[in-house]
């Protein structure tokens, strides 16, 4: 940003702008007459000219500053903001042959696994089984499954020790979210359908969907930046 | 080696019902989809019906809907198929199957059992 | 749902022949078609899944290609135990649908 850009931004008032108080623009006639009044007329004029100029100086330096502050505050921010972008980079788009739903990307296997080598498979993809977060997302999902008899594994199993079914990121499931047909038991996986929800063995081999989450950079809004 | 079993077949008159069962062994029954397919006389092979392992998703042609039932229990390694209002045309020859997912073949076969539905 | 076209319905062939089964889809199913081989009076028995993966303990002779719409199987030396029937099968979208079968006889 260049300092030319900084006193374009500056809207001071017009009596104390830079423009309005300098010295050709004082009135002609008051700097006019017998040579006492003249001398005391010029001696005014100068200190008028002098507490103008010293005014208009400080007026603009003030300023100036308040603006730099501003400018280097925003310059911190945008730093900061580059810093985190830098520390982890976000995804733009969607890798080739991943599917994009609305924050995420999708990848729908076209072979079968049983549901650890799933995980391990979009672990290797730098990616996770789905984690769903409502039934809203859940509908979306299910919209792009194209035949009722294609069952996807998900980033969901039953955890024997807290007797609970478990995302993989650690958290559980809201029962308001899923309704799971099946069995809520020891070595229960969740796949999805084109219509519903299933408990299945997690050794079953079905297809699986991996997740990449889509981090676009936010671009906060600065003057000039 | 997996093995399949099919049973319960014989003659039906028109309108009657039917249960086959097939008896699995040699593998890990609850983690495969099953399926029923079946063949009339000197034809070819129809897909009937196809339950998930669990037993929770079930699909069907749309020859049977409504009349056929597929189900399955899992300690008893045991696939079944309840046939309802029998016709002359599910006559055949009707076979289980391990598989039936898409995108999954049918790897492992019976051999079959014999379904006449005459008066 | 989709229809699948097996051709020829029949053929004579010798032992030690190059025999050609070509199976044709009403719509793109990509590349999930099998192919089994039925003989008489047996159960039908899986060889090439996904169009040309050999299922394990099939003989080498079999080998499947295609995707899309057109998909062949050949048998590159016909042996005595390979006169049979032979259905193509997708796993595309239910109803799962086998072609009407062919029939390799001996000449």
């Known amino acids: 940003m260049d300092q030319q850009a900084i006193y374009a931004e500056l809207n001071l008032p017009t009596d104390s702008g830079p423009e309005s108080s300098s010295p050709s623009s004082l009135p002609r006639d008051v700097c006019q007459g017998s040579p006492w009044h003249q001398f005391a007329l010029k001696l005014s004029c100068a200190g008028i000219i002098l507490l103008v100029l010293v005014v208009t100086g400080l007026s603009v330096s003030v300023t100036s500053l308040i603006q730099k502050s501003s400018i280097e505050k925003c310059s911190v921010d945008i730093q900061q903001s580059r810093n985190k972008t830098t520390e982890r980079p976000g995804l733009l788009n969607c890798p080739i042959y991943w599917q994009q739903l609305r924050e995420k990307c999708l990848l729908f296997s076209h072979t079968v696994n049983p549901w650890n080598n799933s995980l391990a498979d979009c672990s290797t993809k730098e990616s996770s089984l789905l984690l769903i977060r409502d039934k809203d997302e859940l509908i979306h999902t299910q919209n792009l499954i194209r035949d009722k008899a294609i069952l996807f594994w998900i980033g969901l199993n039953f955890s024997l020790s807290e007797k609970n079914w478990k995302w993989i990121n650690g958290s559980f499931l809201n029962s308001n979210d899923l309704e799971i047909r099946g069995d809520a038991k020891e070595n229960s996986c969740i796949s999805i359908s084109q219509t519903s929800v299933y408990s299945e063995y997690c050794s079953t081999e079905i297809r699986w969907i991996c997740q990449k989450e889509l981090t676009p950079v936010r671009n906060k809004v600065y003057p000039d930046s | 080696e997996v093995q399949l079993v099919e049973s319960g077949g014989g003659l039906v008159q028109p309108g009657g019902s039917l249960r086959l069962s097939c008896a699995a062994s040699?593998?890990?029954?609850?983690?495969?989809?099953m399926s029923w397919v079946r063949q009339a006389p000197g034809k070819g092979l129809e897909w009937v019906s196809t339950i998930s392992g669990s037993g929770g998703s079930t699909y069907y042609a749309d020859s049977v809907k409504g009349r056929f039932t597929i189900s399955r229990d899992n300690s008893r390694n045991t696939l079944y198929l309840q046939m309802n209002s029998l016709r002359a045309e599910d006559t055949a020859v009707y076979y289980c199957?391990?598989?039936?997912?898409?995108?999954?073949?049918?790897?492992?076969w019976g051999q079959g059992t014999l379904v006449t539905v005459s008066s | 749902d989709i229809q699948m076209t097996q051709s020829p319905s029949s053929l004579s062939a010798s032992v030690g022949d190059r025999v050609t089964i070509t199976c044709r889809a009403s719509q793109s199913i990509s590349s999930y078609l099998n192919w089994y081989q039925q003989r008489p009076g047996r159960a039908p028995k899986l060889l090439i899944y996904a169009a040309s993966s050999l299922l394990s303990g099939v003989p080498s002779r079999f080998s499947g290609s295609g995707s899309g719409t057109d998909f062949t199987l050949t048998i590159s030396s016909l042996q005595p135990e390979d006169f049979a029937t032979y259905y193509c099968?997708?796993?595309?979208?239910?109803?799962?649908?086998f072609g009407q079968g062919t029939k390799v006889e001996i000449k």
């Open positions: 199957a391990r598989g039936g997912l898409i995108p999954s073949g049918f790897d492992y």
């Open positions: 099968q997708q796993t595309y979208s239910t109803p799962l649908t």
């Open positions: 040699g593998s890990t029954f609850s983690s495969y989809a």
